[in-house]
């Protein structure tokens, strides 16, 4: 079972120094600052799920050296920045989408000995990202998001 933590009850101030090992900003309708880093030097798990995020400003994640899990589920991502993808030790939780192609390519080219990358469909089933991209994002296919008919990853 993945660890969890509750949301801060107040509005998020990006100037705050967060001391916790887990931060939950899910479902807050947040927009991430473009030129400011999240100040959370202890954080292992950052939950940004359900915020309608399309872009991930790379500066925002720059100082999160301890980050292990980044939950981006239920965000309509248009792409994943290469610098973020190149963090080989970062576990990304994201919806199955062709926008993850860049993430997959950067990992494949830069990170050796990795466990298979996964993505999640609308029913919360895990899929092998490589298999999903092959089936759903071949050249000429329209951008796809995950649905229930791909192989279930065990």
């Amino acid at each position: 079972q993945e660890p969890s933590c509750t949301m801060p009850s107040t509005d998020v101030d990006w100037n705050t120094e967060f001391s916790a090992t887990c931060l939950n900003f899910s479902g807050r309708g947040l927009s991430l600052p473009l030129n400011q880093s999240l100040r959370a030097s202890n954080v292992l798990l950052l939950d940004l799920s359900g915020n309608g995020l399309r872009e991930l400003p790379v500066t925002f994640f720059a100082h999160l050296q301890k980050l292990e899990v980044l939950n981006l589920l239920h965000n309509p991502l248009s792409r994943v920045d290469g610098a973020l993808a190149a963090r080989c030790d970062l576990d990304l939780r994201a919806d199955c989408s062709c926008a993850l192609e860049s993430w997959h390519e950067v990992r494949r080219d830069n990170c050796s000995g990795q466990k298979p990358l996964l993505c999640w469909d609308t029913t919360s089933f895990q899929h092998n990202l490589s298999a999903f991209l092959e089936v759903s994002c071949a050249p000429g296919l329209a951008p796809a998001t995950g649905s229930g008919h791909h192989h279930h990853h065990h």
Epitope: Q1, E2, P3, S4, C5, T6, S19, A20, T21, C22, N24, S41, N42, L44, L45, Q65, K66, E68, V69, D89, D91, K115
Partner: antibody
Framework: QITLKESGPGILQPSQTLSLTCSFS??????????VSWIRQPSGKGLEWLAH???????RYNPSLRSRLTISKDTSSNQVVLKLTNVDTADTATYYC?????????????????WGAGTTVTVSS | DVVMTQTPKSMSMSVGERVTLSCKAS??????VSWYQQKPDQSPKLLIF???NRYTGVPDRFTGSGSATDFTLTISSVQAEDLADYHC?????????FGSGTKLEIK
């Protein structure tokens, strides 16, 4: 097999500096997510976390002892050293080092999976 | 600092009985709580992490539950070898803190 073993002076006098060494094997303190903490336990009492050192040499300390504590690592000899200055009888305890490892199938968790047997430290005049 | 309060301080149970140990945090720590077993003259050993995940090799009679501020360690059918002190600890925020422990004695 993963092991940690603490060593220290056993007995020392008030105002002296306590130096403790944690020698470990079976893992590398250069691996991402890896770290070692020092935790102490006065006889018959609970556990008190003292300090942690990360794989990237980042350090965290218990604020109540921050001014007296220094943690360091020597990755080539697989050792972590804790120094506690100006000791008092209240520092008499068993001192443990414990490992925090990243479990790639349980990422984001923080727990101490392996502990040393402990070393007993007595501060007495 | 987060204060972890364990109850009871000690308890005496017969083999086969169900044991429930409580740990309360002074503030919300999510599921960042671990349970450790410390047998006499030994170092602590990890039983449960993430409030409810049983560590490798731990017998399935040990179960952890809870989140936020209230946590429980349950031993479904206590055995003679379970004689030990049990410690809960939080790793949600620095400084990490532990409860004062519960001593389990076997009748």
């Amino acid at each position: 097999q993963i092991t940690l073993k603490e060593s220290g002076p056993g007995i020392l006098q008030p105002s002296q500096t306590l130096s403790l060494t944690c020698s470990f094997s079976g893992f590398s303190l250069t691996t991402s997510g890896m770290g070692v903490s020092w935790i102490r336990q006065p006889s018959g009492k609970g556990l008190e976390w003292l300090a942690h050192i990360y794989w990237d040499d980042d350090k965290r300390y218990n604020p109540s002892l921050r001014s007296r504590l220094t943690i360091s690592k020597d990755t080539s000899s697989n050792q972590v050293v804790l120094k506690l200055t100006n000791v008092d009888t209240a520092d008499t305890a068993t001192y443990y080092c414990a490992r925090r490892a990243r479990d790639y199938y349980n990422s984001g968790h923080w727990y101490f999976d392996v502990w040393g047997a402990g070393t007993t430290v007595t501060v007495s005049s | 600092d987060v204060v972890m309060t364990q109850t009871p301080k000690s308890m005496s149970m017969s083999v086969g009985e169900r044991v429930t140990l409580s740990c309360k945090a002074s503030e919300n720590v999510g599921t960042y709580v671990s349970w450790y077993q410390q047998k006499p003259d030994q170092s602590p050993k990890l039983l449960i992490f993430g409030a409810s995940n049983r560590y490798t090799g731990v017998p399935d009679r040990f179960t952890g539950s809870g989140s936020a501020t209230d946590f429980t360690l349950t031993i479904s059918s206590v055995q003679a070898e379970d004689l030990a002190d049990y410690h809960c600890g939080q790793t949600y925020s620095f400084p990490f803190t532990f409860g004062s422990g519960t001593k389990l004695e076997i009748k």
